[in-house]
Amino acid sequence: HTAAQDNCTCPTNKMTVCSPDGPGGRCQCRALGSGMAVDCSTLTSKCLLLKARMSAPKNARTLVRPSEHALVDNDGLYDPDCDPEGRFKARQCNQTSVCWCVNSVGVRRTDKGDLSLRCDELVRTHHILIDLRHRPTAGAFNHSDLDAELRRLFRERYRLHPKFVAAVHYEQPTIQIELRQNTSQKAAGDVDIGDAAYYFERDIKGESLFQGRGGLDLRVRGEPLQVERTLIYYLDEIPPKFSMKRLTA
């Protein structure tokens, strides 16, 4: 296992318990809540983290208007059911037998129903739009510097392959990061865009999931980039199925 052998910790996930109880007495780290052994050389899946938490081309005007099918996580925290690979199960239910279908990032994509609700497959979120507003600064950041810094962050801190960072848009004070990853593009060992986005979201909120690392210190040419608002939109490969009542509410 890649967890540090000397003190047996998990650098990429502090919501674990590590013990020298793996094969041959090696260090093994298990996610809180689920008990699943995690690979400490990469990001832990959002489902296991949530479970543990509860136990581009640059154009002139390039800000993206989220599509009508974009989902925002309005439901907040819940204790999810994860499959044996650590992914969200397509159907989630609460203690009162209210059920709903989720996408691969665990965001609800149907109306709530009862135990008879069927969710045939886990629908993949293939496009994530991270919408940030930064605190006022003396002047606007240089777009190409900002682009380079955010791409470096996702590559180095979250180990996300650069090809999945589709674009970085900037119109002061709004920054948008587009992550795209189709099922066919994601190879074995690739970090999932949903997991990278979740780690980024927690970092931005000052709730880093990394063990013992300092919080996120984002700087563009030495100038601190301080985020005051974050909105994340999720687009699925298959549009969500909500009743008209919700859409007109």
Epitope: H1, C8, V17, S19, P20, D21, G22, P23, G24, G25, Q28, L32, G33, S34, G35, M36, A37, V38, D39, T42, S55, C82, D83, P84, E85, G86
Partner: antibody, heavy 116, light 113 residues
Framework: QVQLVQSGAEVKKPGASVKVSCKAS????????LGWVRQAPGQGLEWMGN????????NYNEKFKGRVTITADTSTSTAYMELSSLRSEDTAVYYC?????????WGQGTLVTVSS | DIVMTQSPDSLAVSAGERVTMNCKSS????????????LAWYQQKPGQPPKLLIY???TRESGVPDRFSGSGSGTDFTLTISSVQAEDVAVYYC?????????FGQGTKLEIK
């Protein structure tokens, strides 16, 4: 060598509680998960929950939630499993076991008999 | 919860024979992160606690005779005793320790003819 020594047999009335102890020796108590498993007469094995004594993280099998309490005293390297609101079907041998891929260490078992 | 189903429930063989018993899980026990199968086999004799034979589906615990071997991956697993001895009479349990709650199979009882 690693040893887990459990407390002696108990006879309890329905509705009562029982607390079984498990004293560990021969290893660093705080850095391994310790689980509790029960076995009713002539039946199979049933995992009840576990504890990581070093940080007191505890997991319970939903089947027993609300009735079972697992604790640990790191000063004496002893784990405890308390089961409340006992019923006749709780009559079983209760085992503590050090968990992990290569942790084949079990206590000798404690027979708890629930009878009116 | 992961459901573990063992087969057969019991079997009787002559000493020296080869025996196999199976364990099927309702969900995969293969951890994609480390490619380990979180499946253990235990032997339990009357009046004794279970004894660990195999962990990680195929790794023999130290001190366990090499006539015991484990195989399989994902959802289907097998425990093989290459040449059964009289002292192997016991109940054999498979266990998943992949996701909470850990679960056991109902057991396979081995007897000698």
């Amino acid at each position: 060598q690693v040893q887990l020594v459990q407390s002696g047999a108990e006879v309890k009335k329905p509705g009562a509680s029982v607390k079984v102890s498990c004293k560990a020796s021969g290893y660093t108590f705080t850095i391994y998960w310790l689980g509790w498993v029960r076995q009713a007469p002539g039946q199979g094995l049933e995992w009840m929950g576990n504890i990581f004594p070093g940080s007191a993280y505890i997991n319970y099998n939903e089947k027993f939630k609300g009735r079972v309490t697992i604790t640990a005293d790191t000063s004496t390297s002893t784990a405890y499993m308390e089961l409340s609101s006992l019923r006749s079907e709780d009559t079983a041998v209760y085992y503590c076991a050090r968990e992990g891929s290569n942790s084949g260490y079990w206590g000798q078992g404690t027979l708890v008999t629930v009878s009116s | 919860d992961i459901v573990m189903t063992q087969s057969p429930d019991s079997l009787a063989v002559s000493a020296g024979e080869r025996v196999t018993m199976n364990c099927k899980s309702s969900q995969s026990l293969l951890n994609s992160g480390n490619q380990q199968n979180y499946l253990a086999w235990y032997q339990q004799k009357p009046g004794q606690p279970p004894k660990l034979l195999i962990y990680g589906a195929s790794t023999r615990e130290s001190g366990v005779p090499d006539r015991f071997s484990g195989s399989g991956s994902g959802t289907d697993f097998t425990l093989t005793i290459s040449s059964v001895q009289a002292e192997d009479v016991a109940v054999y349990y498979c266990q998943s320790d992949h996701i909470y709650p850990y679960t056991f199979g109902q057991g396979t009882k081995l007897e000698i003819k």
